[in-house]
């Protein structure tokens, strides 16, 4: 603790100019004071002034008023500083002395004589209010006041609390009368060193170094740091935690840039044809009769449906066609014959049956042949029976569908999930794609099936070829090669014509 006992001398009266021993001062009592402050004693005794002592220069002769003086010799009020916790009680001895010697340092002069003394014992609380008193004896009267105040930066009822206002990174506060800290606006904490962040700033994802600020931790954004940042390169996806890329409906792949619903998003099939999705950016158009081309954009010739029978040749006309019939046939489609069974019109071992009393005939064809005269070999693939881009193959009396990867069934109508057999190791995420399953690996693993454990910065060695971009971060320690147009493969090492382009997890 630290404080100051202050004593203000106001007036001293010694009208007869007498000393304590009854003698008079000649020519008058040149008066100075000695003050002794000590711990409380019920009976004041001689001994050290435990709380301090002070002397004044000569302040006047016989009777005089003592003026306030703030500095130099004869300072009033008198200051008795202490460096301990103020106990609240004290004993004070004020002595008036006459000196025949030096005005400024009478204490050192020989022949000093006591005029009078007073003793005060009691309690005194720390405070700014002066306690005024007056003491009389038979010869003298002393008016004075006193108080105890705390030294600068000390507070509390015993001046025991040190507090220094500050405004730096170890605290932003002022001091209350009791010595407690009063934080400056925008600061909090026991030492007022913690800034109060922008209202609403997310407690975990944001922080601040000064008031009304909201600095986002890695992976978060927004004014209040409550919005996650999706993985770099995420195109059609969102996140619920940082660096995620959860694909919007109809999108797939590591960056949600693989269009799984190309038909709906782009409507590539023309002229009323049917569009079927088949993996990222993959689709097939099933054309209506009369149209062809990858997108059914090409109108077929009117003769394309082979309307002329019995070997008639077809000629396109502006909005129609015309059949040129071979000898022995007539009609719009050469469907009528002038031949009879006698002309042996049935080919390929077909049996001829007379009709209309021999004026016409009908051929009964053996297996695998068709046509009015059994002239056509049966092609079971003409009806395009294979779905999802399957290839139709004639096999003797039957036909089979050769399905594309990911499809099965007699007509390739069933979609196979390559992910059903959980091919991805170490908790990898499986994606069904046109060319088979692809695994997105968790942190620390890589490989087509997440079977390789990684312990280094995967992109540091520059694993991607042909100008591909290497990514890490979605799965720390993995790398992803995002291939430029025209290259594919886990490291973009193959030109197109090999596996289809997809950013593989390596």
């Amino acid at each position: 603790g630290s404080g100051i006992f202050q004593l203000r001398l106001q007036e001293f009266v010694n009208q007869r100019g007498m000393l304590a021993n009854g003698q008079s001062c000649e020519p008058g009592c040149r008066t100075f004071f000695r003050i002794c402050l000590k711990h409380f004693q019920a009976t004041f005794s001689e001994g050290p002034c435990t709380f301090g002592n002070v002397s004044t220069p000569v302040l006047g002769t016989n009777s005089f008023v003592v003026r306030d003086k703030n500095s130099g010799s004869g300072r009033n009020p008198l200051q008795l500083p202490f460096n301990f916790t103020w106990p609240g009680t004290f004993s004070l001895n004020i002595q008036a002395w006459h000196t025949p010697g030096d005005d400024l340092r009478p204490e050192t002069s020989p022949g000093n004589s006591l005029i009078s003394q007073i003793i005060i014992q009691g309690s005194l609380a720390v405070g700014k209010i002066w306690r005024t008193d007056e003491q009389n004896d038979t010869l003298t009267r002393l008016s004075y006041s006193y108080r105890v105040i705390c030294s600068d930066n000390y507070y509390g009822e015993s001046c025991s609390r040190l507090c220094k206002k500050r405004d730096d990174h170890f605290g932003h506060y002022e001091c209350q009368p009791d010595g407690s800290l009063s934080c400056l606006p925008g600061w909090t904490g026991k030492y007022c060193d913690q800034p109060i962040c922008l209202s609403g700033c997310h407690e975990q994802n944001g922080y601040c170094s000064k008031p009304d600020e909201c600095i986002c931790r890695p992976g978060w954004q927004g004014r209040l740091c409550n919005e996650c940042i999706p993985h770099n390169g995420c195109r059609h996806g969102t996140c619920s935690i940082p660096w995620q890329c959860a694909c919007d409906e109809g999108w797939g792949g590591l960056f949600c840039d693989q269009d799984l619903n190309y038909c709906t998003h782009h409507s590539p099939c023309k002229n009323g044809s049917t569009c079927s999705n088949s993996g990222p950016k993959g689709y097939t158009c099933t054309c209506l009769p009369g149209y062809t081309g990858e997108h059914c954009e090409l109108g077929l010739s009117k003769c394309a449906s082979n309307p002329c029978r019995n070997g008639g040749s077809c000629k396109d006309q502006e909005n129609s066609y015309h059949c040129l019939c071979p000898p022995g046939y007539y009609g719009q489609h050469c469907e009528h014959s002038t031949l009879t069974c006698a002309d042996s019109p049935c080919f390929n071992g077909g049996s001829c049956r007379e009709r209309n009393q021999g004026s016409s005939y009908a051929c009964e064809c053996p297996p695998n042949f068709t046509g009015s005269n059994c002239e056509k070999k049966v092609d079971r693939c003409t009806s395009n029976p294979c779905a999802n881009g399957g290839q139709c193959q004639n096999r003797g009396p039957s036909r089979t569908c050769r399905c594309r990867p990911g499809f099965t069934g007699t007509h390739c109508e069933l979609h196979i999930s390559d992910c059903a057999r959980s091919p991805c190791a170490h908790g990898g995420t499986c994606h069904d794609l046109e060319n088979g399953p692809v695994c997105t690996c968790p942190a620390g693993f890589s490989g087509r099936r997440c079977e390789v454990r990684i312990t280094h910065d995967a992109c540091a060695s520059g694993p991607c070829f042909n100008g591909a971009t290497c990514y890490t971060g979605l799965s720390p320690n993995n790398f992803v090669c995002n291939c430029p147009y025209g290259f594919v493969g886990s490291r973009c090492e193959f030109p197109v014509g090999l596996p289809p382009s997809f950013p593989w997890v390596a």
């Epitope: 040190l162 220094k164 500050r166 170890f170 060193d193």
Partner: antibody, heavy 121, light 106 residues
Framework: EVQLQESGPGLVKPSETLSLTCTVS??????????WGWIRQPPGKGLEWIGD???????YYNPSLKSRVTISVDTSKNQFSLKLSSVTAADTAVYYC?????????????WGQGTLVTVSS | SYELTQPPSVSVSPGQTASITCSGE??????VSWYQQKPGQSPVLVIY???KRPSGIPERFSGSNSGDTATLTISGTQPMDEADYYC?????????FGYGTKVTVL
């Protein structure tokens, strides 16, 4: 008990960048009660405060060095680092890292053993 | 910039009292720390918050601070107290060290 350990090259060429790391053990660098400071002492001379950092990344630098100093923190490794660019022979000193305690009103109660960095070609 | 001034050296006989001063403008309004540094060693905090001693620091070390001057007092000085002593205060957000005082125990 908290321990601090400085590490980095003992020799740096003039005009290059001095880089030191202080590793804290026996306590978390992410405590809200501490700042983490760098102090240097040229041979035969007194102590000079360089700057300090809070675990959130807030930094404070000596104005006389501010244009050349960068202090950073890596809470995951319990480390903080000093970079001093464009060094000259006058930057030759023993570099100390220390913990500055808010409760001690900024007093540094734990110091590293110091590492001598000499700037010379 | 803020400066703290210390006497370059102080000599004291064993068992006597050594007083080291540290002067700076309105230093009494700042908290002062004192550090002891022996040759080839790191500084050690001996006084913080003007007069408080960290645990393990002997009672013969005491401090005070008022006006423009802070004082470190070593009473009953021992030969092991021979060292350099630095005062330190904060001026806004900058740490400031005194120039240091070499205490020699005669």
């Amino acid at each position: 008990e908290v321990q601090l350990q400085e590490s980095g090259p003992g020799l740096v060429k003039p005009s290059e960048t001095l880089s030191l790391t202080c590793t804290v053990s026996g306590g978390s660098i992410s405590s809200s009660s501490y700042y983490w400071g760098w102090i240097r002492q040229p041979p035969g001379k007194g102590l000079e405060w360089i700057g300090d950092i809070y675990y959130t990344g807030s930094t404070y630098y000596n104005p006389s060095l501010k244009s050349r100093v960068t202090i950073s923190v890596d809470t995951s490794k319990n480390q903080f680092s000093l970079k001093l660019s464009s060094v000259t022979a006058a930057d030759t000193a023993v570099y100390y890292c220390a913990r500055e305690d808010v409760i001690l009103r900024g007093g540094s109660d734990y110091w590293g053993q110091g590492t001598l960095v000499t700037v010379s070609s | 910039s803020y400066e703290l001034t210390q006497p370059p050296s102080v000599s004291v006989s064993p068992g006597q009292t050594a007083s080291i001063t540290c002067s700076g403008e309105r230093l009494g309004d700042k908290y002062v720390s004192w550090y002891q540094q022996k040759p080839g060693q790191s500084p050690v905090l001996v006084i913080y918050e003007d007069f408080k001693r960290p645990s393990g620091i002997p009672e013969r070390f005491s401090g005070s601070n008022s006006g423009d001057t802070a004082t470190l007092t070593i009473s009953g000085t021992q030969p092991m107290d021979e060292a350099d002593y630095y005062c330190q205060a904060w001026d806004r957000d900058t740490g400031v060290f005194g120039y240091g005082t070499k205490v020699t125990v005669l």
